[in-house]
């Protein structure tokens, strides 16, 4: 599709005569008829196969024709065509005298013709004008002509359609030959594919507009080369998506088990020494003068009951002092002036003479102790509760209150991490010293078998055009997730180009 353009420049008819030689009255009011047709070796009358056009009256006798002539005419004259330009043509230009205002052929006498020229030849599409001058005995016509393509048509014969666009279907302008020239940041046959941010990871990243880098699930960062840890992860990182690799001092599937409680929480008070003893477990070793699980209680010197034989203890600045009952003496009232005759044994204890009656010894019933059976047995003094359990006296017995994660009479057993069936997708749970471990069935991985893994359907890289490959777990076949602009089971076809 294109336009043959004819620019009339000057017509000379000095004598103001018609082709017959007869003069025009009062002068030759001149207009032109133009006929464009296919190439003929000898130009003959007949249909104007490429088009025709007429001008209004442009002047009288001799005159120059201005560009875009007034009076409704157009200069250059336009002869549009909607076919491939063949490269050859025939052109007939007739100058006519208009006695009146009606310029239709049927309204003019045949002898109103002033002159007629006919040319033929080759003409290539281009912007340059070809200048020509045709002279007869009485007239001269100077003109130029060219063929140019219509808007959006390109190529040597105006046969290539190309319309610049910047939308969802493409981002390009047209080169002179009709080929597409992608706008900056776009690539592909139809310039539909954006060029991602430089360095954007080929597999983990994609983009929907130029210089962008969007990450596929599980990846983050400017170039999509950093993984995202598992959703439930608390104190961990990853080297591949959805992992949870524990930071130092943390354990468990989601790194939520505190293996370094001492450092993270500093539970021991009053300068006590803290020792980690398993998940969320610790032991405080108190400085002298302090007690309690966290050494939070200040000991009175008298709290250790140093006075024996019923002596009463009094705290002093520099220690303590024992007030001994009658019959006893010494720093701790440990020496007796009594004998069995004084019934010194309390709580049903039986008295035995010693040193020929100079002293005695008490044999105590169960649950009592002391030289005079005056003290109730404290079954917690031997610290029988393991793993930081708290010992409680309960009458003649004792019991341990265990910390979370431990059980048993003495808190000696670790509660099974497998009890709550943490392994997903039919994984088998194993209790280990360091926590639990899941043995996953085929097709699953991760600390809890929570990650679907490809069997091997994607091993052959079946997907084209940077598509993401997934394994369909129900059929062990691959599924290609196509990037924008591609379709097909392997993403092998650009959108708009069906398989040939």
């Amino acid at each position: 599709s294109g336009v043959f353009q004819l620019q009339l420049q000057e017509f000379v008819n000095e004598r103001g005569v018609l082709a017959s030689g007869r003069p025009c009255e009062p002068g030759c009011r001149t207009f032109f008829r133009v006929c464009l047709k296919h190439f003929q070796a000898v130009v003959s009358p007949g249909p104007c196969t490429f088009g025709s056009v007429s001008t209004p009256v442009l002047g009288t006798n001799s005159f120059a024709v201005r560009d875009d002539s007034s009076g409704g005419g157009r200069n250059p004259l336009q002869l549009p065509f909607n076919f491939t330009w063949p490269g050859t043509f025939s052109l007939i230009i007739e100058a006519w005298h208009a006695p009146g205002d009606d310029l239709r052929p049927e309204a003019l006498p045949p002898d109103a013709l002033i002159s007629k020229i006919a040319i033929q030849g080759s003409l290539a599409v281009g912007q340059n004008w070809l200048l020509d001058e045709q002279t007869s005995t009485l007239t001269r016509l100077r003109y130029s002509y060219r063929v140019i393509c219509s808007d959006n048509y390109y190529g040597d014969n105006c046969s290539r359609l190309c319309k610049k666009r910047n939308d969802h279907f493409g981002h390009y302008v047209c080169q002179p030959d009709g080929n597409l020239s992608c706008l900056p940041g776009w690539t592909g046959e139809y310039c539909q594919q954006p060029i991602c941010l430089s360095g954007c990871h080929e597999q983990n990243g994609y983009c929907s507009k130029p210089a962008e880098c969007l990450c596929r699930p599980g990846w983050q960062g400017r170039l999509c080369n950093e993984c995202i840890p598992h959703n439930g992860c608390r104190h961990g990182t990853c080297s591949t998506p959805w992992q949870c690799t524990c930071d130092e001092g943390w354990g468990g599937l989601f790194c939520d088990q505190d293996l370094n409680y001492c450092t993270h929480h500093s539970p021991c008070k009053n300068g006590a020494t803290c020792s980690n003893s398993g998940q969320r477990s610790y032991t405080c070793t108190c400085r002298p003068g302090y007690t309690g699980v966290d050494c939070e209680l200040e000991l009175s010197e008298c709290d250790s009951n140093p006075c024996r034989n019923g002596g009463s203890c009094k705290d002093q600045e520099d220690g303590y002092h024992c007030l001994c009952p009658p019959g006893y003496y010494g720093l701790h009232c440990e020496h007796s002036t009594l004998s069995c005759a004084d019934s010194p044994c309390f709580n049903g204890g039986s008295c035995r003479e010693r040193n020929q009656g100079a002293s005695y010894a008490c044999e105590c019933p169960p649950n009592f102790t002391g030289s005079n059976c005056e003290k109730k047995v404290d079954r917690c003094t031997s610290n029988p509760c393991a793993n930081g359990g708290q010992c409680l006296n309960r009458g003649p017995s004792r019991m341990c209150r265990c910390r979370p994660g431990f059980t048993g009479t003495y808190c000696e057993r670790h509660v099974s991490d497998c009890a709550r069936n943490p392994c997903a997708h039919g994984g088998t749970c194993h209790d280990l010293e360091s926590g639990l471990m899941c043995t996953c069935p085929a097709g699953f991985s991760g600390r809890r078998c929570e990650v679907r893994t490809s069997i091997d359907a994607c091993a052959s890289s079946p997907c084209f055009n940077r598509a993401t490959c997934y394994t369909d777990l129900s059929t062990d076949t691959f599924v290609c997730n196509c990037p924008y602009g591609f379709v097909g089971s392997r993403c092998e076809f650009p959108v708009g180009l069906p398989p040939s």
């Epitope: 699930p217 599980g218 983050q220 104190h235 930071d247």
Partner: antibody, heavy 118, light 107 residues
């Protein structure tokens, strides 16, 4: 226990500014990407912005680009949303959430209400 | 942006009922879909991610299924605490988008 606590919401006039804060605890904040998600009164959820943990890369929904800025201070375990040139349509409860634009939002704060009205 | 359409927008059910909520994506999102539960005046809570994986601490009566564009959340036996609004969310394509919500009410 993971905790996210938002603050800084309130009533502001159109064209005004607000800065929302989110204090995080119970997890290693610097290891995880974070996001803001909003919910207009009686409406659905709408992702607003995201910041990566690795290099602080930020992403925004089109309607807030150039007006909102998401940032984080790993030393203070805090996430922020600076909101400028506020419009009536920004009125919503704003939630701080742990997650990226391409991952689920695993933990959410209790939300803070932002009302833009003259 | 990918459109997420939930149906129904509301439904009434009784304790012990089996309930199904569906979510449809306007284009393929593979398995990258999450479900959230939100109670009035509270923040959303993650129930399910990657279409069918249960989040930590979520009861096993909740389950998810589907792939591509059609997804389902099922509650096998409704409990009183399950009456809430449920949202689906895709995180396969940027930007992430949510469904409009399904309100589950007591019959």
């Amino acid at each position: 226990e993971v905790q996210l606590v938002e603050s800084g919401g309130g009533l502001v006039q159109p064209g005004g500014s607000l800065r929302l804060s989110c204090a995080a605890s119970g997890f290693t904040f610097s290891n995880f990407p974070m996001a803001w998600v909003r919910q207009a009164p009686g409406k659905g959820l709408e992702w607003v912005a995201t910041i990566s943990s690795s290099d602080g890369t930020t992403y925004y929904r089109d309607s807030v680009k150039g007006r909102f800025t998401i940032s984080r201070d790993n030393a203070k375990n805090s996430l922020y949303l600076q909101m400028n040139s506020l419009r009536a349509e920004d009125t919503a409860v704003y939630y701080c959430a742990r997650g990226y634009y391409n991952s689920p939002f695993a933990y959410w704060g209790q939300g803070t209400l932002v009302t833009v009205s003259s | 942006d990918i459109q997420m359409t939930q149906s129904p927008s509301s439904l009434s059910a009784s304790v012990g009922d089996r309930v199904t909520i569906t979510c449809r994506a306007s284009q393929d999102i593979y398995y990258n879909l999450a479900w959230y539960q939100q109670k009035p005046g509270k923040s959303p809570k993650l129930l399910i991610f990657d279409t069918s994986s249960l989040a930590d601490g979520v009861p096993s009566r909740f389950s998810g299924s589907g792939s591509g564009t059609d997804f389902t959340l099922t509650i096998s036996s409704l409990q009183p605490e399950d009456f809430a609004t449920y949202f689906c969310q895709q995180y396969d394509w940027y930007p992430p988008t949510f469904g409009q919500g399904t309100k589950l009410e007591i019959k």
